[in-house]
Interface confidence: low
Amino acid sequence: SCNTATCVTHRLAGLLSRSGGVVKDNFVPTNVGSEAF
């Protein structure tokens, strides 16, 4: 099973499937993870 933080945070947040969006650095995050390096 997936053991990286990406998968853990996505499972918790229900974000395995997401759409793109424009974000700003001071935006309050819903999760943090390693979707990409």
């Epitope: 947040a13 974000v23 995050p29 943090v32 390096f37």
Partner: antibody, heavy 122, light 107 residues
Framework: EVQLVESGGGLVQPGGSLRLSCAAS????????ISWVRQAPGKGLEWVAE??????????HYAEAVKGRFTISRDNAKNSLYLQMNSLRAEDTAVYYC?????????????WGQGTLVTVSS | EIVLTQSPATLSLSPGERATLSCKAS??????VSWYQQKPGQAPRLLIY???NRYLGIPARFSGSGSGTDFTLTISSLEPEDFAVYYC?????????FGQGTKLEIK
């Protein structure tokens, strides 16, 4: 402007040590997960180590090839990332990049530095 | 360790043509695959994450697809600046791994 600037590379003899630094600016450094990724001359990319954000206790993970020899750390007050490299080998010769990422749930942000060259040779 | 195998190793095409790059994982990685572009002397640039999500600022001609073990990066109509090396990577399991790269060259 977002910037990641690596430094500390150079020529070192086999068995020697080197400490790489990555200075970040233009974003909230403490929120970001950061990896060191390396690229041997003329070769592909290889992940080296990862350190999580401050809120995730700055937990670390390493590639088997460097485990026990390399240590990744961060100083959020200085917006800096480090890679302490000990017992260096010829196969550690590479350009070392720091790469940061932040997952907002709706999108991610991903920044890379331009790299610093480490040459391990006698 | 999850091995990513990219094909072809080299792809020779002309501007305006469609490019299809493949990445196959040795184990199931759901959709935790990213694609990077790298030009000589430059750092990698993220194109696609989560198998199919285009990164901010990436032109619409780049698209990603796939899940499980088979993934594809498609460039619908090649521009001169697209000729570079492309890498896939996975963040499903530690250690994170990269494919060996596909060199996209001008025919």
């Amino acid at each position: 402007e977002v910037q990641l600037v690596e430094s500390g590379g150079g020529l070192v003899q086999p068995g020697g040590s080197l400490r790489l630094s990555c200075a970040a600016s233009g974003f909230t450094f403490s929120n970001y997960w950061i990896s060191w990724v390396r690229q041997a001359p003329g070769k592909g990319l290889e992940w080296v180590a990862e350190i999580r954000s401050e809120s995730d206790a700055s937990a670390t993970h390493y590639a088997e090839a460097v485990k026990g020899r390399f240590t990744i750390s961060r100083d959020n007050a200085k917006n800096s990332l480090y890679l302490q490299m000990n017992s260096l080998r010829a196969e550690d010769t590479a350009v070392y990049y720091c790469a940061s990422y932040f997952d907002y749930g709706l999108a991610i942000q991903n920044y890379w530095g331009q790299g610093t060259l480490v040459t391990v040779s006698s | 360790e999850i091995v990513l195998t990219q094909s072809p190793a080299t792809l020779s095409l002309s501007p305006g043509e469609r490019a299809t790059l493949s990445c196959k994982a040795s184990k199931r990685v759901t959709t935790y695959v990213s694609w990077y572009q790298q030009k000589p002397g430059q750092a990698p640039r993220l194109l696609i994450y989560g198998a199919s999500n285009r990164y901010l600022g990436i032109p619409a001609r780049f698209s990603g697809s796939g899940s499980g073990t088979d993934f594809t990066l498609t460039i619908s109509s090649l521009e001169p600046e697209d000729f570079a090396v492309y890498y896939c990577s996975q963040s499903y399991n530690y250690p994170y791994t990269f494919g060996q790269g596909t060199k996209l060259e001008i025919k």
